[in-house]
């Protein structure tokens, strides 16, 4: 194209600039080290430093290791990125018992209240349940099967201690476990037909929360009530619903009683790292330029292998669209691309301040 | 050196209320959490509950024989830890020690590596 | 909760030998490679003492005749060889839940 000489040539007298015939316009040079954060540079602030990958960069320049969220109670909240940490959060009917930079010391899960003890604050990511005597007279709401028979008057104390300090919570302390019969009694309950004889008039047994009022004779509506954004999941728990407020989310569902938000990537992206409910990562949709296509697996598998996609064929995308968009991302199955979980490394157990790197070194960590 | 001391113990009605202090020394006590352990006389140690740090919002768990009749607080500014105690039974008779436990492991691994030589409560009518 | 069963109650070891301990919990108190099991020493008229976390890992300051092993549900600490200020009550603790609970104690005696 002889009408770009001009736009060229005016890039060639100056050593720090390049001519990016893709986008037909002059270009800045970043210097030895520095990476573009675009296609097609402008000033020097459009350099950065390239970290290695599952490195990220600090607000002090220095390639810090993200990190990981390899023991069993964590969950990948948010990934790795150019200048911000993964961050870990505890996996769902757990809370974080002890916060780290980025992640969580240590999980917990949910206590469920014992006898003579009711729901006051259902437990959240951050916090285990609180818990708070059950008052004398009320339509007993089994927190425990021994809340279901009439309380001796020696297990309930008629008055609320006064706690010192403000601050402090009864958090009850009997873990609730997904496997437990009450869990499945209260699940069975939630999918019953509210006409069925079983659920009518029955005070909930579900451990963890109770109603809000005793069950009004005949009615079926005696479920959990959760605070807003939580749901109640399969095992009776209240459970945060996802959050879809990274930008590159959009709400696909809302978070119902008994059903998570969901989160899909925004139009003109696809999940390139698929998670519960949402997606940890997005990525831009590629136009007709992807050779391989995902093999679709049971979800609850951790690695999603790629094969070569049939002879002719192409992963959905436009090759000149028309309006600019591109459809969005809506089974983690379309993925293009999944990262595999962090290799586990070996535990370093010490009484030391120390995390692992996503490499394996140990790094000081400041708890 | 680190220290803790506990105090308040002594003998009380069943149905009274009693509050123990921890006073410690030698270590940065706002960055730790603090423990409530008993021993009944003869027998075992029996885990009370624990308060965490600043941290971590200064928030308490409890075992299911005291929740609900006892709660954990502390003055960081004096490096003192509290136990409210109240209903008290026969039962809670006991040595009450305050523990520390350093939240510094990835994981933390709560273990309680300092305590107070206890003070003893009775209660008794 | 999860219950720990020390065991023996209570043994008798001559000076030298080998002293052997074991703590069973109820349910698996390990994650992630971590085995959230603590012992402790508690001498007569004297507040405990913690002598290993995480199953295996000595607090600073303890001998090294003290070491630690296990994983999951069964877990042991030997002290060998057995000294006479050994005498005491060892008890293990677990962290792996809410609540925390310590084992009955085993009372060690020097023969």
């Known amino acids: 194209f002889p009408q770009d000489r001009p736009f060229e040539d005016t890039c060639h007298g100056n050593p720090s600039h390049y001519y990016d015939k893709a986008v037909r316009r002059c270009c800045y040079r970043c210097p030895m080290g520095l990476f573009p954060t675009q296609q097609c540079p402008q000033r020097p602030t459009d350099c950065r430093k390239q970290c290695e990958p599952d490195y990220y960069l600090d607000e002090a320049d220095r390639c810090t290791a993200c990190v990981t969220c390899s023991r069993d109670d964590l969950v990948e909240k948010t990934p790795c990125a150019w200048n911000s940490s993964r961050v870990c959060e505890c996996r769902p009917g757990m809370f974080c018992s002890t916060s780290a930079v980025n992640s969580c010391a240590r999980c917990f899960f949910h206590s469920v209240c014992p006898a003579g003890m009711i729901v006051k604050f259902p437990g959240t990511a951050q916090k285990n349940t609180v818990c708070e005597p059950a008052s004398p007279g009320v339509s007993p709401a089994c927190a425990s099967p021994e809340n279901c028979k009439e309380p001796s008057s020696g297990t309930i104390p008629q008055a609320k201690p006064t706690p010192v300090s403000p601050a402090t919570s009864s958090a009850s302390t009997m873990p609730v476990r997904g496997g437990t019969r009450l869990a499945q009694e209260a699940a069975s309950k939630l999918t019953r037909a509210p006409d069925s004889p079983s659920s009518v008039g029955r005070p909930s047994s579900d451990p963890g929360l109770s109603p809000t009022q005793p069950c009004p004779e005949g009615s079926g509506d005696c479920r959990k009530q959760c605070e807003p954004d939580y749901y109640l999941d399969e095992a009776g728990r209240c459970t945060a619903c996802v959050s879809c407020s990274r930008d590159d989310l959009v709400e696909k569902t809302p978070c119902a009683w008994n059903s998570s938000r969901t989160c899909e990537c925004r139009p003109g992206m696809i999940c390139a790292t698929s998670a519960t409910n949402s997606c940890a990562r997005c990525v831009p949709y590629p136009i007709c330029a992807a050779e391989t296509v995902t093999k679709p697996q049971d979800m609850a598998e951790k690695d999603t292998t790629f094969e070569a996609p049939p002879l002719g064929t192409q992963p959905d995308c436009n090759p000149t669209p028309e309006n600019g968009e591109a459809p969005a991302s809506t089974s983690p199955t379309q993925s293009l691309l999944v990262d595999s979980q962090a290799s586990k490394t070996l535990p370093i157990p010490t009484s030391a301040p120390v995390a692992l790197s996503s490499t394996g070194k140990p790094v000081l960590d400041a708890g | 050196e680190v220290k803790l001391v506990e105090s308040g113990g002594g003998l009380v009605q069943p149905g009274g209320s009693l509050r123990l202090s921890c006073a410690t020394s030698g270590f940065t006590f706002s960055d730790y959490y603090m423990n409530w352990v008993r021993q009944p006389p003869g027998k075992a140690l029996e885990w009370l509950g624990f308060?965490?740090?600043?941290?971590?919002?200064?928030?308490?768990e409890f075992s299911a024989s005291v929740m609900g009749r006892f709660t954990i607080s502390r003055d960081d500014s004096q490096s003192i830890l509290y136990l409210q105690m109240n209903t008290l039974r026969a039962e809670d008779s006991a040595t009450y020690y305050c523990?520390?436990?350093?939240?510094?492991?990835?994981?933390?691994?709560?273990?309680?590596?300092?305590w107070g030589q206890g003070t003893s409560v009775t209660v008794s009518s | 909760d999860i219950v720990l069963t020390q065991s023996p109650a209570s043994l008798a070891v001559s000076l030298g030998q080998r002293a052997t301990i074991s703590c069973r919990a109820s349910k698996s108190v390990s994650a992630s490679g971590y085995n959230y099991m603590h012992w402790y020493q508690q001498k007569a008229g004297q507040p405990p003492k913690l002598l290993i976390h995480l199953a295996s890992n000595l607090e600073s300051g303890v001998p090294a005749r003290f070491s630690g092993s296990g994983s999951g549900t069964d877990f042991t600490l030997n002290i060998h060889p057995v000294e006479e200020e050994d005498a005491s009550t060892y008890y293990c603790?677990?962290?792996?839940?809410?609540?925390?609970?310590f084992g009955s104690g085993t009372k060690l005696e020097i023969k």
């Open positions: 523990a520390r436990d350093p939240p510094y492991g990835n994981p933390h691994y709560y273990a309680m590596d300092y």
């Open positions: 603790q677990h962290s792996g839940e809410l609540p925390f609970t």
């Open positions: 308060i965490r740090n600043k941290a971590n919002g200064y928030t308490t």
